[in-house]
């Protein structure tokens, strides 16, 4: 039994103690505020260059955003005591470009991580799963935000960013408990093939302000938890019978098309006749044709198969430069 | 519905105990901190103690240290005050409060967000 | 222990006046801070948590600001509902502790 004393604090410039003692296990490391009654640590916009060694074992909610981190290794979380109580973990904007393997290791009820807006040259396949077994020991990870993670050109490794992220979160089948995963605004020009079928829990999936062209090699089947599909401000340019079916066939599901350009030509027609019938798509009287020319803003809703036409295709003797 | 009920007030004399409960219902109570918060007759809001949901952690007021015990039991989802030697200024109406924090729960502290209606505890010779 | 000091302690106000109530704190709690109302033989009810916070179900009209050691609770247009005690709380650090209360009545 603990009494009531100043075990937290919110006065961020507190030294670290000098004799050689190690720290006490509720206080508050130095540039932090810290409240143990909120079970809450947060280190803001605070140019720190590694996660502090002398967290509070009360924490559940680590707030390092605004940082520079650069690297997050093996274990930097780990201690002992474990942080056994840590639930959510935001390290947003803290410049990360590199996040090694069994970063997030020991920390037992990690249900949230977010690291958005965070420059990843480097994930590492075993960032979230701790181990390169073929099936690793289940990740406690609920939800995971991986907003704005796209390294700029200059900083990409050789392999493309889809798939490395893609091995991330297959790896040792570590997250078939997640339940949220966002990918929003990572350039992405297409989703890997066979990622989601790892991923069965998920019930809200943020693919929105990406460049996606095609969803042709993407199975929706056994996300049959979904309740929120994001795909908001693609490249989008027809979904095909396929993934018509597939959507259609999940339970819960809504799915957001918005600002993508939509390609009104023949293919569109079984687009267009099932979005007139389905109640999967949130807002569909919004989404607008982009092309051809002449079908520019014309709402999908209104069309029928007398507009959906596509130009002959030329015989090559016949076609001009 | 989530439901937190006090029993166990009374009046008693100075020096005396008393054991306040609260049955909870409505919500899982072992993955719950949980607090009593106290209040004087025409006076304000005064916090007494405090226990997490395993029971690992508390934390008392001053003014009770020494004399109240905050205690669970998780299988019959009930939360105790275990009061001794009794003052007069410890006659309040006593509420049980769940906080918000859960074991499974991630984000932020919305504080003490459920109460019981209260039991009256009158310290008197 | 942090003491919190809250005021007025009580005020007058009619339906639809915009009411502030003040809280400052002995010494900094970042933005570690709740409000509650509670009305006559009731249960206190949490209205703003992290100082600025909207509680589910709380209705619009009641904001709060502040961080470091002064805080604030505005409502906006006071509705026939809304007269009752209202109290600041930290939980920068245990104990926690309330403000005394700001009793908001009918004018």
């Known amino acids: 039994t603990s009494s009531a004393s100043s075990s937290s604090s919110s006065a961020p410039f507190l030294a670290s103690a000098a004799s050689a003692q190690p720290p006490l296990p509720d206080q508050c490391p130095a540039l932090c505020e810290c409240s143990e009654a909120a079970r809450t640590v947060k280190c803001v916009n605070r140019n720190l260059t590694e996660v502090p060694t002398d967290l509070p074992l009360y924490v559940r909610n680590l707030f390092l955003t605004g940082n520079q981190l650069a690297v997050l290794p093996a274990g930097a979380f780990a201690r002992r005591p474990p942080l056994a109580e840590l639930a959510a973990l935001n390290l947003s904007g803290s410049r990360l470009d590199e996040v090694r393997g069994g970063a997030f290791e020991h920390l037992p009820s990690l249900r949230q991580l977010d690291l958005s807006h965070n420059p990843l040259a480097y994930l590492s396949p075993f960032a979230f799963s701790g181990s390169n077994a073929s099936i690793s020991a289940p990740s406690p990870l609920v939800e995971l935000i991986l907003n704005h993670i796209v390294p700029p050109d200059d900083k990409r490794q050789n392999r493309s960013f889809e798939g490395m992220v893609a091995a991330a979160l297959v790896a040792g089948r570590a997250l078939q408990g997640l339940h949220l995963l966002e990918l929003a605004s990572n350039h992405f020009l297409y989703l890997p093939r066979d990622v989601l079928a790892q991923l069965p829990s998920l019930r809200y999936l943020d693919l929105s302000n990406n460049s996606l062209v095609s969803l042709t090699y993407v199975s929706f089947r056994n996300l049959t938890h979904l309740e929120s599909l994001h795909l908001e401000d693609n490249a989008l340019k027809v979904l095909h019978n396929g993934t018509l079916a597939e959507l259609q066939g999940l339970p819960h599901v809504r799915v957001f098309l918005d600002n993508n350009p939509w390609v009104c030509d023949c293919h569109m027609a079984d687009m267009v006749t099932w979005l007139k019938q389905t109640g999967v798509v949130q807002g569909k009287d919004r989404l607008t044709c982009a092309f051809p020319e002449k079908m520019r803003n014309r709402v999908l809703l209104e069309l029928n198969s007398a507009d959906l036409d596509c130009d002959p295709i030329l015989p090559p003797s016949l076609q001009t430069s | 519905q989530v439901q937190l009920v006090e029993s166990g007030g009374g009046v008693v004399q100075p020096g005396r105990s008393l054991r306040l409960s609260c049955a909870v219902s409505?919500?899982?109570?072992?993955?719950?901190?949980m607090n009593w918060v106290r209040q004087a007759p025409g006076k304000g809001l005064e916090w007494v103690t405090f226990i997490s949901y395993d029971g690992s952690n508390k934390y008392n007021a001053d003014s009770v240290k020494g004399r109240f015990t905050i205690s669970r039991d998780n299988s019959k989802n009930t939360l105790y005050l275990q009061m001794n030697s009794l003052r007069a200024e410890d006659t309040a109406v006593y509420y049980c409060?769940?906080?918000?924090?859960?074991?499974?729960?991630?984000?932020?502290?919305?504080?003490?967000?459920?109460w019981g209606q209260g039991t009256t505890v009158t310290v008197s010779s | 222990d942090i003491q919190m000091t809250q005021s007025p302690s009580s005020l007058s106000a009619s339906v639809g006046d915009r009411v502030t109530i003040t809280c400052r704190a002995s010494?900094?709690?970042?933005?570690?801070l709740a409000w509650y109302q509670q009305k006559p033989e009731k249960a206190p009810k949490s209205l703003i948590y992290?100082?600025?916070s909207l509680q589910s179900g709380v209705p619009s009209r009641f904001s709060g600001s502040g961080s470091g050691t002064d805080f604030t609770l505005t409502i906006s247009s006071l509705q026939p509902e809304d007269f009752a005690t209202y109290y600041c709380q930290q939980y920068n650090s245990y104990p926690l502790t309330f403000g005394g209360g700001t009793k908001v009545e009918i004018k």
């Open positions: 010494q900094g709690i970042s933005s570690w």
């Open positions: 409505g919500f899982t109570f072992s993955s719950y901190d």
């Open positions: 992290a100082a600025s």
């Open positions: 409060a769940r906080d918000s924090y859960s074991r499974s729960w991630y984000g932020d502290y919305y504080g003490m967000d459920v």
